[in-house]
């Protein structure tokens, strides 16, 4: 059995040249003719040189999985899905995303260091001593309140709560 060159495919004991991306094999090569190729029908594609008798079906971006169509399918490129705003891609296969997760909400005591994108989750960071955050989408931790000379500090601030002052 012969081993075919790269971008050739085996038919019986003959090696045939592959079709270009965007095409599929209509008729395999013979003594006098090379591989006859046909364009991929609508909603199908081949992304690489290939020996396929049929083009591959275009992917569908499922909104129930948090996906939206970012780039329509073409005869030589599969559909590119992206996550809807507020979500990031959990399972990325090349340029294709199959499932999305909601961006993490930073807990109290942390601030948003890096906002989430379509392909990255939110990055949270702890508040430094002397500051606090209620969490959520807050990008800056707020400084604790300094009780005035006429106020008494009832409870010291934490990374998630402000200082409590009394007016007595």
């Amino acid at each position: 059995q012969p081993s075919c060159r790269q971008e050739e495919f085996l038919v019986g004991d003959e090696c045939c040249p592959m079709c270009n991306p965007g095409y599929h094999v209509k008729q395999v090569c013979s003594e006098h003719t090379g591989t006859v190729c046909a364009p991929c029908p609508p909603q199908t594609y081949t992304a690489h040189a290939n020996g396929l008798s049929k083009c591959l079906p275009c992917g569908v971006c499922d909104p129930d999985m948090g996906l939206l169509t970012w780039q329509e399918c073409s005869s030589w490129k599969d559909t590119v899905c992206r996550c809807i705003p507020g979500y990031f891609c959990e399972n990325q296969d090349g340029s294709h995303c199959s499932t999305c997760l909601q961006h993490t909400t930073c807990p109290p005591g942390q601030r948003v260091e890096k906002r989430g994108t379509h392909d990255q989750d939110t990055v949270c960071a702890d508040c430094l001593t002397g500051t606090f955050s209620l969490g959520g989408t807050q990008e800056e931790c707020l400084p604790w309140t300094n009780c005035s000379a006429f106020q008494q500090e009832v409870r010291r601030g934490t990374n998630s709560t402000d200082t409590t002052c009394s007016s007595q």
């Epitope: 971008e7 050739e8 040249p17 003719t33 090379g34 591989t35 190729c37 046909a38």
Partner: antibody, heavy 118, light 108 residues
Framework: EVQLLESGGGLVQPGGSLRLSCAAS????????MNWVRQAPGKGLEWVSA????????YSADSVKGRFTISRDNSKNTLYLQMNSLRAEDTAVYYC???????????WGQGTLVTVSS | EIVLTQSPGTLSLSPGERATLSCRAS??????LAWYQQKPGQAPRLLIY???TLQSGIPDRFSGSGSGTDFTLTISRLEPEDFAVYYC??????????FGQGTKVEIK
């Protein structure tokens, strides 16, 4: 003797249309795929379009897709190329050529000149 | 899309000399390569198909070789009528049918 004779070329304005014909003789016309190949002045050869023997399968180069249509009338032994929305870059000698399946071209006509200019 | 690159662009030789023309494909086209000769003001003429098969009526001083990506057209002894432009064409995977850019063989 195989003969291919093109006609229909001429001067046309950009955006205009033209229909080329190729009269074939000396072989069983319906048994062969037929092609149009063009050559811009001083340039190389560029395949334009192909049609199967029955006329059921047609292919075109990306550069002419949606503008040029290849067809044939096997009862008249004639190949056609309908050219619409012509551009300056379509200026060339257009040859019709007999194909071995969608392979090489064993016989060529003498060509007809299409000039697209305002 | 497959690209065919012919070299050299121009070959300056004298009658009686041997001419070697090269055609390289960007990916394998098997043995499915043809060579054509074109003289000024004339249509191309098929010389060789299937990389090495001589078209009927073509003198045997013309020969072709190669497969896959590298092909050669050889004219063993140049005759005055052989000075012309030569094109290679792949039909290993078509459409589209692709031609090389041509090699001009001129008198030195």
């Amino acid at each position: 003797e195989v003969q291919l004779l093109e006609s229909g070329g001429g001067l046309v304005q950009p955006g205009g249309s033209l229909r080329l014909s190729c009269a074939a003789s000396g072989f069983t016309f319906s048994s062969y795929s037929m092609n149009w190949v063009r050559q811009a002045p001083g340039k190389g050869l560029e395949w334009v379009s192909a049609i199967s023997g029955s006329g059921g399968g047609t292919y075109s180069a990306d550069s002419v897709k949606g503008r040029f249509t290849i067809s044939r009338d096997n009862s008249k032994n004639t190949l056609y190329l309908q050219m619409n929305s012509l551009r300056a870059e379509d200026t060339a000698v257009y040859y019709c050529a007999r194909g071995k399946a969608y392979g090489y071209f064993d016989y060529w006509g003498q060509g007809t000149l299409v000039t697209v200019s305002s | 899309e497959i690209v065919l690159t012919q070299s050299p662009g121009t070959l300056s030789l004298s009658p009686g000399e041997r001419a070697t023309l090269s055609c390289r494909a960007s990916r394998s086209v098997g043995k499915y390569l043809a060579w054509y000769q074109q003289k000024p003001g004339q249509a191309p003429r098929l010389l060789i198909y299937a990389a090495s098969t001589l078209q009927s009526g073509i003198p045997d001083r013309f020969s072709g070789s190669g497969s896959g990506t590298d092909f050669t057209l050889t004219i063993s002894r140049l005759e005055p009528e052989d000075f012309a432009v030569y094109y290679c064409q792949q039909y290993g995977s078509s459409p589209p049918v692709i031609f090389g850019q041509g090699t001009k063989v001129e008198i030195k």
